[in-house]
């Protein structure tokens, strides 16, 4: 595991900075992927992980940034514009939309932090919100009032 | 506002510990809630947020722990055992299951950290994985081989 240097603030340092010495491993989604005969196809499998059995199936796309914590994030990408029929598992049903569920996740970006006299004092972590897509969900289309 | 003290390790300290001085705010999911006439009922709305328009609708339950970071997490709770019909939005279709999508989220627990001679040196953050349910997904039931 690689470590980011720890950073301890001198008294005058901005208290909004988040400071961390870090040892991290990527945390992929919980359920391990199983082989999927048509990994990118718009169909709902009868076995395999949840994202391939869903009638709004999706794949995960890795987003890696070594200056961000967590370094590895996964974005869901819908494989169908509409939901797949529960009956056949392959034909699309235009009465349902496959929509991404988003979440604003807290992440940290490392940047140099400086001591009292402007000297480089390791790295500090800057807190940001980062938009990730968690899954695809089969929804009824909005009816505008 | 007061802050947890930062904690910098002495040389011999275990490098698997994550150490942080932190200022955070709860980060709720992205889409604001809209009114839902039957907030706890098993139906798919034609308006409102994604979790109420889904044919596997869910609600969010707050999980707050003041010694954890983030302090506020939200767990999805499915409102139906099966998926709701796309046609009616209310009748359940036994051909589809409403299943929770889980994720192992990185969280931090605070605990006292100690200096070289066992003296109390503020708080350290211990990294853990914490299982959260993100959403409910309409899936085809597994066919056992």
């Amino acid at each position: 595991y690689s470590h980011w240097p720890s950073c301890c603030p001198s008294k005058g340092q901005d208290t909004s900075e988040e400071l961390l010495r870090w040892s991290t491993v990527p945390v992929p989604p919980l359920e391990p992927a199983r082989p999927n005969r048509h990994p990118e196809s718009c169909r709902a499998s009868e076995d395999g992980p949840l994202n391939s059995r869903a009638i709004s199936p999706w794949r995960y796309e890795l987003d890696r940034d070594l200056n961000r914590l967590p370094q590895d994030l996964y974005h869901a990408r819908c494989l169908c514009p509409h939901c797949v029929s529960l009956q056949t598992g392959s034909h699309m049903d235009p009465r349902g939309n496959s929509e991404l569920l988003y979440h604003n996740q807290t992440v940290f970006y490392r940047r140099p932090c400086h001591g009292e006299k402007g000297t480089h004092k390791g790295y500090c972590l800057e807190r940001r919100l980062y938009r990730v897509s968690l899954a695809c969900v089969c929804v009824r289309p909005r009816v505008m009032g | 506002y007061s802050h947890w003290p930062s904690c910098c390790p002495s040389k011999g300290q275990d490098t698997s510990e994550e150490l942080l001085r932190w200022s955070t705010v709860p980060v709720p999911p992205l889409e604001p809630a809209r009114p839902n006439r039957h907030p706890e009922s098993c139906r798919a709305s034609e308006d409102g947020p994604l979790n109420s328009r889904a044919i596997s609708p869910w609600r969010y339950e707050l999980d707050r722990d003041l010694n954890r970071l983030p302090q506020d997490l939200y767990h999805a709770r499915c409102l139906c055992p099966h998926c709701v019909s796309l046609q009616t939005g209310s009748h359940m279709d036994p051909r589809g299951n409403s299943e929770l999508l889980y994720h192992n989220q990185t969280v931090f627990y605070r605990r006292p950290c100690h200096g070289e001679k066992g003296t109390h040196k503020g708080y350290c953050l211990e990294r853990r994985l914490y299982r959260v349910s993100l959403a409910c997904v309409c899936v085809r039931p597994r066919v056992m081989g």
Partner: antibody, heavy 121, light 107 residues
Framework: EVQLVESGAEVKKPGASVKVSCKAS????????MNWVRQAPGQRLEWMGL????????SYNQNFKGRVTLTVDTSASTAYLELNSLRSEDTGVYYC???????????????WGQGTLVTVS | DIQMTQSPSSLSASVGDRVTITCSAS??????LNWYQQKPGKVPKLLIY???SLHSGVPSRFSGSGSGTDFTLTISSLQPEDVATYYC?????????FGQGTKLEIK
Amino acid sequence: EVQLVESGAEVKKPGASVKVSCKASGYSFSGYTMNWVRQAPGQRLEWMGLINPYNGGTSYNQNFKGRVTLTVDTSASTAYLELNSLRSEDTGVYYCAREDYDSWTFFAMDYWGQGTLVTVS
Amino acid sequence: DIQMTQSPSSLSASVGDRVTITCSASQGINEYLNWYQQKPGKVPKLLIYYTSSLHSGVPSRFSGSGSGTDFTLTISSLQPEDVATYYCQQYINFPYTFGQGTKLEIK
């Protein structure tokens, strides 16, 4: 100026339901959780639950045995408390209260509605 | 649930007196304690948060202290407008719980 304005007094029969509203103004409604607190005559304050308007996320006091439902209408900046299967001991003043917070240290009810008197008899 | 117990339940003091109200938690709550003031016929108001931090607009004669299970609200010099019932509240765990209140009157 932050304001929480609750609906008017209600008189209900035992077994009925009541729905109290709380209209917020003067701040970003979705940015703060809303608590509901009850005060029966001569009794201590009793926390009923809270709701995050951003996602409808809730936490309830289990002592109310599932009789409480909290909802919001973000477009109207309004929170709702519904209490069903009313009994005489539910008589009291019901308050909504905005919850402020700071990193790690506090969650506190900094603004309160004027209260809604619910009488069950 | 965490039980919060205040003492005394009521007290009478003179203007200018130093007044102390205590609050005891049935288990340790670190410093996760708030104090509220409710004047007769009025809505509760936040007085002190996180054991000792004064809410904005609250006079400096009010102070709070404590940690773990035992907490204190102190009014250094009682004023006539301080007539009220005072409640402590823990927020380390759901459900939030309040003390039974301390009714403060002027002699």
